[in-house]
């Protein structure tokens, strides 16, 4: 006999990175017929939603109108059909950004390099932080961590055309509180014609997601669709 229902899916719209004082929606998708959804934050009950009519709804949205550092952290959700509860969803890491200061991102030997050259990014922030994050626009949400008192270095090693793209960095005050993003640095990698034409970009941040994040930053607009990637949920784990 089944003791629990399948776990729901959880995600943030428009983005799991939320500028402070901006809004975010946390979505939880379970099953039709669920009479109650619960959103948990860092192990404590955060909010409840009882969809009406439950048989016609399989997703609820929890609105956070005013993001701040107290609400940054790990979220999960569960749902109930009758008296039977689901397994908890995966954890959603909600990050507050635009805290305190803006780091400076630079690249050595420069933004235009030849395939095979060793490239290192440097992220500098003079305020009290020791963790830095380097992100590249693209599809798979890979984030590199670096450590240092005021500066972290991110050696990419010998680069290929797959490293081409736009990079930004953040200073991190804790896992879920990040600085303003740095100004972007565009890395151009040239190789021989054959390699260049055959080597596709290997972007490492969800497509269109950075644009959505910037839209949120600049205007506070809320897009009513998911722009997330499963790997983004593992960002801080």
């Amino acid at each position: 006999q089944q003791q629990t229902l399948p776990k729901p899916f959880i995600w943030a719209e428009p983005h799991f990175m939320v500028p402070k004082e901006k809004q975010v929606t946390i979505c939880c998708q379970g099953n039709y017929g669920a009479v109650e959804y619960q959103l948990h934050f860092e192990g404590s009950l955060f909010a409840v939603d009882r969809p009406k009519p439950p048989e016609r709804i399989n997703k609820v949205k929890f609105y956070i109108p005013d993001m701040n550092s107290r609400m940054a952290g790990q979220y999960s959700c569960i749902y109930r059909v009758g008296e039977l509860w689901s397994e908890p969803s995966n954890l959603l890491d909600l990050v507050v950004t635009e805290m305190y200061d803006t780091p400076t991102l630079s690249v050595h030997p420069g933004p235009e390099v030849i395939s095979g050259e060793k490239v290192t990014f440097y992220c500098r922030l003079d305020t009290a932080t020791s963790m830095f994050l380097l992100l590249k626009e693209g599809r798979s949400s890979h984030v590199q961590r670096g450590y240092g008192k005021v500066q972290a270095e991110f050696p990419l090693g010998p680069v290929t055309t797959a490293h081409r793209g736009t990079y930004r960095c953040f200073g991190s005050y804790n896992n879920h509180a990040w600085s303003f993003p740095s100004e972007p640095v565009k890395l151009l990698v040239t190789g021989d014609i054959e390699n260049t034409s055959l080597a596709p970009e290997d972007p490492t941040f969800p497509a269109d997601t950075w644009g959505t994040y910037l839209l949120t930053t600049e205007t506070g607009l809320q897009k009513d669709h998911a722009l997330w990637d499963h790997t983004a949920q593992n960002l801080l784990r």
Epitope: F46, D49, Y63, P65, M71
Partner: nanobody, 126 residues
């Protein structure tokens, strides 16, 4: 900007009743989820009850069956009817709002609330 003003606190004997009111200014009340929290001397602020825009309610286990939260959108007011009061209910009671929000959202965690009242004192003693 939303302003919340609580009233109705006072001293009552164990087993007695009180009704707290929270009047909200502005035209945003209908789009707000509302909640009551309390803080006893020397203790942390704790959740008491909450109500969604659509009228769904949620209660702390300690007050379930004794307290009732309700709202009157025409009067921009949320109420907390408290009965069978106990000494451990003694606290400053705060009204809070999440503005704006979705219709069925009920918020339990204090961090979710972006507007707070100044509080009203409830004392339960013989």
């Amino acid at each position: 900007e939303v302003q919340l003003v609580e009233s109705g606190g006072g001293e009552v004997q164990p087993g007695g009743s009180l009704r707290l009111s929270c009047a909200a200014s502005g035209r945003t009340f209908a789009s707000a989820a509302m909640g009551w929290f309390r803080q006893a001397p020397g203790k942390e602020r704790e959740f008491v009850a909450a109500i969604s825009r659509s009228g769904d309610t949620y209660y702390a286990d300690s007050v379930k069956g004794r307290f009732t939260i309700s709202r009157d959108n025409a009067k921009n007011t949320v109420y907390l009817q408290m009965s069978s009061l106990r000494a451990e209910d003694t606290a400053v009671y705060y009204c809070a709002a999440v503005v704006p929000t979705y219709g069925n959202n009920i918020y339990v965690h204090s961090a979710a609330y972006n507007y707070w009242g100044q509080g009203t004192l409830v004392t339960v003693k013989p």
